[in-house]
C-alpha cells in the first residue's frame, strides 16, 4: 500500500531549524532506513507530499501553514503531517489535524500550548519543549536550594515569532507548578534603550535568580550593566536561556565558548561580568550513531538541497524529526499487524506515546501526553581560562542532574547565592532594619 | 446563473449579534427584495449554504469557523462568504478568503487589524468597527478640548472574546493618530476585588478623562468606588462604552435609561456617582424603514427561526448584513453588466468600496478601504428625574457631532474638567509647589 | 526644555590643568550615559571620554587616557572633565553631549549636545 | 579600537540631488552606527540612529542603511538647509570612534 506523509514546513528560508533544507535530508535519511529494514512497513511504499508554512517573504505564516495543510489534505487524504515546526504556524494546523483526526508529528512547536492535547489531539512532538525546560529548571532550584523566588526576563525582537515568550511562558508554567515558588517575569525590546534603564532598576528589586532569554549581544550588554550597577556573581545569578548555544558557537560572534568575547573595548569588563553568568542549552547527543547521521545529513544537505548545514545544536531538530518519523513507522507497522489501518490516526498514536526508542538523538522517551523528555546542558565559566563548558546535564526521562566528573559550578562565595537576599529585597526584614546597637541591650 | 452565499456564523447559539438565528431573517429579507427588483442580478438564482463558526460548546472557535469556510469553498465554491463576526472566527476565514480571492462581507469582526487589507484582501465590512469609535471620541476630544490626556480601562471576562480588548485597542490606536495625546491604558478582571482597589490608586495618577469598557455592573461598581474616594464629576469625567446600550436597556438589568438603578440600597450614591458619568454608543437608526424592517425581522425570525429577537441597538447588526449584502448584490449586478463575472471579486469589491448607499439602517457609507462609517450617540443624565437620554450625535460620514435640540452636555461647574489638572497628575507643575507667601513678596 | 550648558573652558599654558563642568536640566540626569566630545578648530569631532550612569563605567580616547578625568554628581546634575598635563594639541570646542542609553555597554547616539566650551593650551 | 573611514571628504551638489555618503568601519560593528549632521558654529545633530533609524523631527529624505562594516547615508532630495558636514559614528565599542567627515556644499 501507499502512505503519505503531508509535509508543512518553510520550503524556501534555511534559517529555522525546522526548515525543509535541514529536515529534508533528515526524511529521505529515515524512509532509506524503512526501506532497508523488512521489519518496517513491508511492501509499503512512503511518499512524501510538500507544503510550505511561509509567506511570501519567507516567513513562518499562520495563514499559509494552514491553507497548504487544507490544499495537501484534500489532494492527498495524507495518513500524516510533518511539521509546522514555528508556533504560530503550527498553531493553527495542529487544531485542524485534530479536528480530521489526523495524526501530526513535529520536532518544533515548543510552546506551552501545544502540550493541551484535547486541542492538539493526535500531536506528538518528537522534539524538545519549552515546558520541559521547566523540569530541568526546578530539579536545579530543588538542588540549589532556590524555592522561594526567580525573576525570568525575556526579550522582544521584530521578526523573531516571539521565541522568548513562548520559552519563557512554558518555563514559567512549569516551574510554578513544580516549585511553590514566586517568579516574576518581564518583557524588554532589545533595540530600545530606555527599556535596559527599567531592567537595571527593576532587577535588584525582584529577583537575585535571573533568567534571561535573549540575543548572545542582549545578554551581554544585561551583564555588563549589572556589573556596572553592582549586581555581582556573590548576590546574583543571571542563566542565559540559550537553548541552541548561539552564543557559544563563536563564527562571525563570540569566539567559540567565550560568550564575552567581542572586541569591542568591553572585554575585560564582559569576562568579569560573565563569572555571574551561567548558560542553559539543550543537550549534545554524545552517542556515535549521532555523529554518523550528522555525517550523512550534511552530505545529503548539500548533494540534494545544496544547502551546507553548519555544525552546532541546531541539528538536533532535523535529528527529532528523523527520530519521530521512524517512530511513528513503527507504530504504524504495528497498528496493520493488528488488523488496524494507516488511517485509524488514534490507535497509531497511542502506540507512539509513553514510549522508548533507540534513535539517532539517542535514548528518546515520549511522554504519556506524546511530548519527548528533554535533556538539557548547563554551562559555566572556567574561571582559569573564562571558557565555558558543560558542568551538569539533565536527563529528562530520569528527571536526574547529572554532574561532568572533574568540573563543578563555579561560585564567587563557593555557594549558591540565596534566591532572596538576606534582609529582603527591599531590606523589608525586621531584623535587618533594628539600631546597630541594639546588640548590646 | 446561480449564485452562492456561504455564511459562517454561529448556527445554534443565538446571544452573539450576529447570530444566524437573527442574521438568517435579515438575509431572507435582502433575498426577497433582490426576487422582488427586476434591476437586481436578473435571471441569477441566489442560495445560502451554511458553516457555523462555534465549536461544540456554541463558542466562537478559530478553528471550526476556517474549517467550516475551507468545506464550505471545496464542496459549493461560492462567490462570496458572509460573516464571521466573532474577531477570532473571522481573523483566520479573512486571511483564506483573502488567499482565495473571495469577498468577505460581515458586519462584525469590528477589531482594529481587520482594517489592514492587504492582510484582510476583499473583506468589506458593512457594521460598525472599533476604530470609527476613535473617530468620534477625537471630534468629541476636539470640541471639548481634551487634547493632552486620556486614560482608558478594560474589563477582561472570561468567555467575552476579549470585546472590550479589541474595543479599546481599536479605539486608542485611532485616538492617537488623529490627535497627538498621551493615552494609557489598563486591564482589569471584573471578578477581581483586587483589581478594583488598584485601579483607584491608578486613575488619579493618571487621568481625569476616563473612558471605560465594562459590563454595567462593572461600570456601576467603578462609579461607586469613584465617588467613594471623592473622584467627582467637578474634576473627572467617566465615559461608558457600552456601544450596545445594554446598560440602559431595562429588562432584568437597570431601569431603562438608569443605569445608575439596581434597588440594593446604594441607588441613591450610584445616582450621584453617575453625574460624572456618560454613555457611548451606536446610534439607533432613526429612519421610517428601519422600523418597518424591524417588524419584519422579528416576525421572519418567530416564524422561521423560533426565535424571539429583543429590541436594542444589538439589531443594527442583522440590519447591517442586509444592507450589506444588498450592497454586495448591487456591485454584482454592475460587474455583470460591464461584462465580468461572480467569480470576479476583486472588481466586485471595489465597487462596493467608497460608495454610498440608502439601506435600511438609513445613509450608508463605505470607505476607501472597505469600512462603514459609523454612527454613535453620547448619552448624559438629566439631572431633573436621573433618566439618561443622547444628547449628541455623530455622523461618521460627515465626521461631525451633532448636538439634539434642547439638550446640553451636563457639567457639575458648568463646563468639562480639564484633562490635566491644573497642577499636574502628581502635583509636579513648580507653580503650585511654591510656598503660599510668595505671593507676598 | 532639555539643555546642556558647558563652562570653565578658557586659556591655560601647557602642561596645567583645567575642570570643565556642564550643567544638565529637563531631564532625568541618572537615566543616562554623558559624553564629553572636542573640536579643534577647522577639523573634526573626536570622542573624549564617557561614563555611565552611575559611574560604573568610564571610557577614555587613548589620546587623553591618564590625563583626563572624567566624573559626574547626579544629585547636581552635573558632569565633570579634569584635564592635567594639558597639551596643544588638546586645544579645541568641547562638547558635552548626553547619551541616548543608560551605559556606555549600550549604543545609544549622542541626541543632545552642548554649545560647547573653548579650551586653548598655549604658551 | 575601531576605524570609521568616510567617504568623499567633501561633494559638491545641487539643490534636488541625490546624496550619497558612505562610512566602514575596520571590523563588524553590527548596526550600531549613528550620523550626525553639523553646520558651521553650530553644535552636531543626531539624524540616524543604529544605521537607519530616523529621529524624530529629522526629514524623511534622510536615510541610512548597512551593517556590519559598510553604511550609507543618503539624502534623496537635497535642500539648501542641507549643506553642512556629516558624520559617521560607531556605538559598538569602547572607546567611541567618528569618521573624519564628509563636507556638502554648493555647486
Known amino acids: 500500500g501507499n502512505l503519505t506523509v503531508a509535509v508543512v514546513l518553510p520550503l524556501a528560508n534555511t534559517s529555522y531549524p525546522w526548515s525543509w533544507a535541514r529536515v529534508g535530508p533528515a526524511v529521505e535519511l529515515a524512509l532509506a532506513q524503512v526501506k532497508a529494514r523488512p521489519d518496517l512497513l513491508p511492501g509499503w511504499t512512503v511518499r512524501t507530499v510538500l507544503g510550505s508554512s511561509e509567506n511570501a517573504l519567507g516567513v513562518c505564516s499562520d495563514t499559509a501553514a494552514p491553507l497548504a495543510a487544507v490544499d495537501l489534505k484534500w489532494e492527498h487524504n495524507p495518513a500524516v503531517f510533518l511539521g509546522p515546526g514555528c508556533v504560530y504556524a503550527a498553531a493553527p494546523v495542529g487544531r485542524f489535524t485534530a479536528h480530521w483526526r489526523v495524526p501530526l508529528l513535529t520536532a518544533g512547536a515548543p510552546a506551552l500550548g501545544f502540550g493541551v492535547k484535547d486541542e492538539y489531539a493526535l500531536t506528538t512532538r518528537a522534539g524538545p519543549s519549552y515546558a520541559k525546560l521547566g523540569d530541568f529548571v526546578a530539579a536545579l532550584h530543588r538542588r540549589l536550594g532556590w524555592e522561594r523566588q526567580a525573576l525570568m526576563l525575556y526579550a522582544y525582537r521584530p521578526g523573531d515569532e516571539e521565541h522568548c515568550f513562548f520559552l519563557v511562558e512554558g518555563l514559567f508554567m512549569r516551574v510554578r507548578d513544580r516549585l511553590n515558588i514566586t517568579v516574576d517575569h518581564l518583557e524588554f525590546a532589545e533595540d530600545d534603550l530606555s527599556h535596559y534603564t527599567r531592567l537595571l532598576r527593576t532587577m535588584p528589586r525582584k529577583g537575585r535568580v535571573i533568567y534571561i532569554c535573549s540575543s548572545p549581544d542582549a545578554f551581554r550588554t544585561l551583564m555588563l550593566l549589572a556589573l556596572e550597577a553592582g549586581l555581582c556573581g556573590e548576590d546574583y545569578v543571571f542563566f542565559h536561556l540559550d537553548i541552541f548555544g548561539q552564543s557559544l558557537q563563536g563564527g562571525q560572534g563570540p569566539a567559540p565558548r567565550r560568550p564575552w568575547e567581542r572586541g569591542d573595548g568591553q572585554d575585560v569588563s564582559a569576562r568579569q561580568a560573565f563569572q555571574a553568568a551561567k548558560i542553559i542549552t539543550y543537550k549534545d547527543p554524545d552517542n556515535p550513531e549521532y555523529l554518523e547521521f550528522l555525517k550523512q545529513l550534511k552530505h545529503l544537505a548539500y548533494e540534494q538541497f545544496n544547502f551546507t548545514m553548519e555544525d552546532g545544536l541546531v541539528n538536533t531538530i532535523p535529528a527529532s524529526f528523523h527520530d519521530g518519523l521512524l517512530l511513528y513507522i513503527q507504530a504504524v507497522t504495528e497498528t496493520l499487524a493488528h488488523g488496524g489501518t494507516v488511517t485509524d490516526g488514534e490507535n497509531i498514536t497511542q502506540r507512539m506515546w509513553n514510549r522508548s526508542f533507540q534513535g539517532v538523538t539517542g535514548y528518546l522517551k515520549i511522554d504519556s501526553s506524546g511530548d519527548r523528555e528533554t535533556d538539557f546542558s548547563l554551562w559555566d565559566m572556567d574561571p582559569e581560562n573564562g571558557a565555558f563548558r558543560v558542568v551538569l546535564n539533565y536527563n529528562g526521562t530520569s528527571q536526574e542532574l547529572v554532574a561532568v566528573s572533574g568540573r563543578k559550578l563555579n561560585w564567587p562565595l563557593g555557594y549558591p547565592p540565596p534566591d532572596i537576599p538576606k534582609c529582603g529585597f527591599d531590606n523589608e526584614d525586621p531584623a535587618c532594619n533594628q539600631d546597630h546597637l541594639s546588640t548590646l541591650e | 446563473g446561480n449564485l452562492t452565499v456561504a455564511v459562517v456564523l454561529p448556527l445554534a447559539n443565538t446571544s452573539y449579534p450576529w447570530s444566524w438565528a437573527r442574521v438568517g431573517p435579515a438575509v431572507e429579507l435582502a433575498l426577497a427584495q433582490v426576487k422582488a427588483r427586476p434591476d437586481l442580478l436578473p435571471g441569477w438564482t441566489v442560495r445560502t449554504v451554511l458553516g457555523s463558526s462555534e465549536n461544540a460548546l456554541g463558542v466562537c472557535s478559530d478553528t471550526a469557523a476556517p474549517l467550516a469556510a475551507v468545506d464550505l469553498k471545496w464542496e459549493h465554491n461560492p462567490a462570496v462568504f458572509l460573516g464571521p463576526g466573532c474577531v477570532y472566527a473571522a481573523a483566520p476565514v479573512g486571511r483564506f478568503t483573502a488567499h482565495w480571492r473571495v469577498p468577505l462581507l460581515t458586519a462584525g469582526a469590528p477589531a482594529l487589524g481587520f482594517g489592514v487589507k492587504d492582510e484582510y484582501a476583499l473583506t468589506t465590512r458593512a457594521g460598525p468597527s472599533y476604530a470609527k469609535l476613535g473617530d468620534f471620541v477625537a471630534a468629541l476630544h476636539r470640541r471639548l478640548g481634551w487634547e493632552r490626556q486620556a486614560l482608558m480601562l478594560y474589563a477582561y471576562r472570561p468567555g467575552d472574546e476579549e470585546h472590550c480588548f479589541f474595543l479599546v485597542e481599536g479605539l486608542f490606536m485611532r485616538v492617537r493618530d488623529r490627535l497627538n495625546i498621551t493615552v494609557d491604558h489598563l486591564e482589569f478582571a471584573e471578578d477581581d476585588l483586587s483589581h478594583y482597589t488598584r485601579l483607584l490608586r491608578t486613575m488619579p495618577r493618571k487621568g481625569r478623562v476616563i473612558y471605560i469598557c465594562s459590563s454595567p455592573d462593572a461600570f456601576r461598581t467603578l462609579m461607586l468606588l469613584a465617588l467613594e474616594a471623592g473622584l467627582c464629576g467637578e474634576d473627572y469625567v467617566f465615559f461608558h462604552l457600552d456601544i450596545f446600550g445594554q446598560s440602559l436597556q431595562g429588562g432584568q438589568g437597570p431601569a431603562p435609561r438608569r443605569p445608575w438603578e439596581r434597588g440594593d440600597g446604594q441607588d441613591v450614591s450610584a445616582r450621584q456617582a453617575f453625574q460624572a458619568a456618560k454613555i457611548i454608543t451606536y446610534k439607533d437608526p432613526d429612519n421610517p424603514e428601519y422600523l418597518e424592517f424591524l417588524k419584519q425581522l422579528k416576525h421572519l425570525a418567530y416564524e422561521q427561526f423560533n426565535f424571539t429577537m429583543e429590541d436594542g441597538l444589538v439589531n443594527t447588526i442583522p440590519a447591517s448584513f442586509h444592507d450589506g449584502l444588498l450592497l454586495y448584490i448591487q456591485a454584482v449586478t454592475e460587474t455583470l453588466a460591464h461584462g465580468g463575472t461572480v467569480t470576479d471579486g476583486e472588481n466586485i469589491t471595489q465597487r462596493m468600496w467608497n460608495r454610498s448607499f440608502q439601506g435600511v439602517t438609513g445613509y450608508l457609507k463605505i470607505d476607501s478601504s472597505g469600512d462603514r462609517e459609523t454612527d454613535f450617540s453620547l448619552w448624559d443624565m438629566d439631572p431633573e428625574n436621573g433618566a439618561f437620554r443622547v444628547v449628541l450625535n455623530y455622523n461618521g460620514t460627515s465626521q461631525e457631532l451633532v448636538a439634539v435640540s434642547g439638550r446640553k452636555l451636563n457639567w457639575p461647574l458648568g463646563y468639562p474638567p480639564p484633562d490635566i489638572p491644573k497642577c499636574g497628575f502628581d502635583n509636579e507643575d513648580p507653580a503650585c509647589n511654591q510656598d503660599h507667601l510668595s505671593t507676598l513678596e | 526644555e532639555v539643555q546642556l550648558v558647558e563652562s570653565g573652558g578658557g586659556l591655560v599654558q601647557p602642561g596645567r590643568s583645567l575642570r570643565l563642568s556642564c550643567a544638565a536640566s529637563g531631564f532625568t540626569f541618572d537615566d543616562y550615559a554623558m559624553h564629553w566630545v572636542r573640536q579643534a578648530p577647522g577639523k573634526g569631532l573626536e570622542w573624549v571620554s564617557g561614563i555611565s550612569w552611575n559611574s560604573g563605567t568610564i571610557g577614555y580616547a587613548d589620546s587623553v587616557k591618564g590625563r583626563f578625568t572624567m566624573s559626574r554628581d547626579n544629585a547636581k546634575n552635573s558632569l565633570y572633565l579634569q584635564m592635567n598635563s594639558l597639551r596643544p594639541e588638546d586645544t579645541a570646542l568641547y562638547y558635552c553631549?548626553?547619551?541616548?542609553?543608560?551605559?556606555?555597554?549600550?549604543?545609544?547616539?549622542?541626541?543632545?549636545w552642548g554649545q560647547g566650551t573653548m579650551v586653548t593650551v598655549s604658551s | 579600537d575601531i576605524q570609521m573611514t568616510q567617504s568623499p571628504s567633501s561633494l559638491s551638489a545641487s539643490v534636488g540631488d541625490k546624496v550619497t555618503i558612505t562610512c566602514r568601519a575596520s571590523q563588524n560593528i553590527r548596526t550600531y552606527l549613528n550620523w550626525y549632521q553639523q553646520k558651521p558654529g553650530k553644535a552636531p545633530k543626531v539624524l540616524i540612529s543604529t544605521a537607519s533609524s530616523l529621529q524624530s523631527g529629522v526629514p524623511s529624505r534622510f536615510s541610512g542603511s548597512g551593517s556590519g562594516t559598510d553604511f550609507t547615508l543618503t539624502i534623496s532630495s537635497l535642500q539648501p538647509e542641507d549643506f553642512a558636514v556629516f558624520y559617521c559614528q560607531q556605538s559598538f565599542g569602547i572607546p567611541r570612534t567618528f569618521g573624519q567627515g564628509t563636507k556638502v556644499e554648493i555647486k
Open positions: 553631549a548626553k547619551d541616548m542609553g543608560v551605559s556606555l555597554a549600550l549604543w545609544g547616539a549622542f541626541d543632545i
